[in-house]
Interface confidence: low
């Protein structure tokens, strides 16, 4: 009498998730007598996955008829299959008694299941930093299977090579997640740079994934000052000027002190941006010089983005502009209320 | 969707040089992916030339390297075929397609016909 | 470089039967990722080439679940469970594993 053998033609079956997977078994013989059963693993832990005669298996078929007589295919198709089924499928044969006595198993299917990485989620630092200084994106995407997986940075297109990836967990499991840290140094025109991180797997069928991040985000370029005087009107008026230039972000303060003395505070809102995304801003101080006997220490000081605030001083030479009549005394008399400083 | 097409002059001078160049729309260039050029002489079967990776690096067919260059510029989104010392032996529909890490080659452009003849 | 050789090079069909094309390399194409670096092509009358099958067994967007690629090593199977009209022109398999990637002549299917 030939031996019974219990045929899994197919070593390995790799289906996308959301798929059907096939598992095929055909048996050589019909005696003895007795049901198959498929498992999931093997040794005293396994799983009953399908067993014909009893249970609720909502989510298996059979291929074939199992009823049918002379029937010798004992295939079964698993629907709507989720990472979590993947494992070695075996096709197990028992002779028919009280109970049933398990004969011969097939060599067993390994089922791999192909699932796609969840869309790249980029994070930036948690404070702004200046030109030249490095900062560290992280790019995670978690689900997908198998564990080969290509991560990319670019930075405006460009490749990044300072680096560190990795794929959890190291051993075998049903899905698995990548994490990637990308070192950035950053310029003075980076505001509208943007670092992409990309991911390709092979259920992407050649579409990586992709998430960004903006550096504008990330950077802070403090501003340039320059204090000018414009030359002296009629009046005896001085028009001193304090320019900040090439700032970002736009969160700005600008105090002009007189002597030491707050004369006026600004806030910065609604600049129109250069080219490069940075931001300038001029402010004007008018001061009358035929109020004053002595030289004007007028300050520009600027606190940007809730950095230690910039100073730039300026002296206007009251010695150096001609006075009217009866000025001095009028200075004397008015005090410090009426400077005429707009 | 990613789409290709290719361009270029249908008709080379034997000893010429061969050059086409492929427009890559819907995707960017600088994706993980190698950017291939494959020709179909008349009747014929596939033959792969070689790909390029947007970074630069390249490979060749080791039967037409000495020959080819293949150039990739990002700013326009598009790769290039250069194919000197042309015979009318290199008379061929010649297709541009996307090659992607982990899988085969597709899209293809719809293929231009490139013919060698003084 | 690496040799593919399909059969049939021409197979007559018969609309709703099946059709079944080898395809067999000179060394294996199996990766040590577990993947077989085989991807199948099909090249409609007057069109471009377009995938089927990528690494030996999986579907192409968009690709009937009447084409199945099966195999490992160095022999492959491409098998159209129904062969309907629109099917019909020149299959190829072809090798990413190394390069140059390398195609098989090609198998022509048409209706008896």
């Known amino acids: 009498e030939e031996e019974l053998q219990v045929i899994q033609p197919e070593k390995s079956v790799s289906v996308a998730a959301g798929d059907s997977a096939t598992l095929n078994c055909t048996v050589s013989s019909l005696i003895p007598v007795g049901p198959i059963q498929w498992f999931r693993g093997a040794g005293p832990g396994r799983e009953l996955i399908y067993n014909l005669k009893e249970g609720h298996f909502p989510r298996v078929t059979p291929v074939s008829d199992p009823t049918k007589r002379n029937n010798m295919d004992f295939s079964i198709r698993i629907s709507n299959i989720t990472p979590a089924d993947a494992g070695t499928y075996y096709c197990v044969k028992f002779r028919k008694g009280s109970p049933d006595v398990e004969l011969k198993s097939g060599a067993g299917t390994e089922l791999s299941v192909r699932a796609k990485p969840s869309a790249p989620v980029v994070s930036g630092p948690a404070v702004r930093a200046t030109a030249e200084h490095t900062v560290s994106f992280t790019c995670e995407s978690h689900g997908f299977s198998p564990r080969d997986i290509t991560l990319k940075w670019f930075k405006n297109g460009n490749e990044l090579s300072d680096v560190q990836t990795n794929v959890d967990p190291a051993g075998k499991s049903v899905s698995y997640s990548i994490r990637s840290t990308a070192r950035v140094v950053l310029t003075r025109r980076d505001v509208h740079s943007q670092v992409i991180c990309e991911v390709a797997h092979v259920t992407l069928q050649g579409d990586p994934l992709r998430g960004t991040a903006n550096l504008s985000e990330a950077i802070r370029v403090p501003p340039f000052l320059e204090v000018t005087q414009q030359s002296m009107r009629a009046d005896n008026q001085v028009n001193v000027t304090c320019q900040v230039t090439k700032f970002y972000p736009q969160r700005l303060q600008l105090t002009w002190l007189e002597n030491g003395n707050v004369s006026r505070t600004e806030m910065a809102s609604a600049l129109p941006e250069n080219k490069d995304g940075t931001y300038n801003w001029t402010s004007w101080l008018l001061v009358n010089v035929s109020a004053h006997r002595d030289d004007v220490k007028l300050t520009c000081q600027v606190e940007h983005d809730g950095q230690p605030a910039v100073n730039k001083s300026f002296s206007v030479k009251v010695s150096a502009h001609p006075k009217e009549q009866g000025s001095n005394t009028a200075a004397e008399n008015t005090g410090t209320n009426e400077r005429n400083i707009y | 969707q990613v789409q290709l097409q290719e361009s270029g002059p249908g008709l080379v001078k034997p000893s010429g040089t061969l050059s086409l160049t492929c427009a890559v729309s819907?995707?960017?260039?600088?994706?993980?992916?190698?950017w291939s050029w494959v020709r179909q002489p008349p009747g014929k079967g596939l033959e792969w030339i070689g790909e390029i990776y947007h970074s630069g690096s390249t490979n060749y067919n080791p039967s037409l390297k000495s020959r080819v260059t293949i150039s990739v510029d990002k700013s326009k989104n598009q790769f290039s075929l250069k194919l000197s010392s042309v015979t009318a032996a290199d008379t061929a529909v010649y297709y541009c397609?996307?090659?992607?890490?982990?899988f085969g080659v597709g899209p293809w452009g719809q293929g231009t016909l490139v013919t060698v003849s003084s | 470089d690496i040799v593919m050789t399909q059969s049939p090079l021409s197979l007559p069909v018969t609309p709703g039967e099946p059709a079944s094309i080898s395809c067999r390399s000179s060394q294996s194409l199996l990766h040590g990722n577990g993947f077989n670096y085989l991807d199948w092509y099909l090249q409609k009358p007057g069109q471009s080439p377009q995938l089927l099958i990528y690494l030996g067994s999986n579907r192409a967007s968009g690709v009937p679940d009447r084409f199945t690629g099966s195999g490992s090593g160095t022999d492959f199977t491409l098998k159209i469970s129904r062969v309907e009209a629109e099917d019909v022109g020149v299959y190829y398999c072809?090798?990413?594993?190394?390069?140059?990637?390398?195609f098989g002549q090609g198998t022509k299917v048409e209706i008896k």
């Open positions: 397609a996307r090659r992607g890490i982990w």
């Open positions: 072809m090798q990413g594993l190394q390069t140059p990637r390398t």
């Open positions: 819907g995707g960017s260039i600088s994706s993980s992916n190698w």
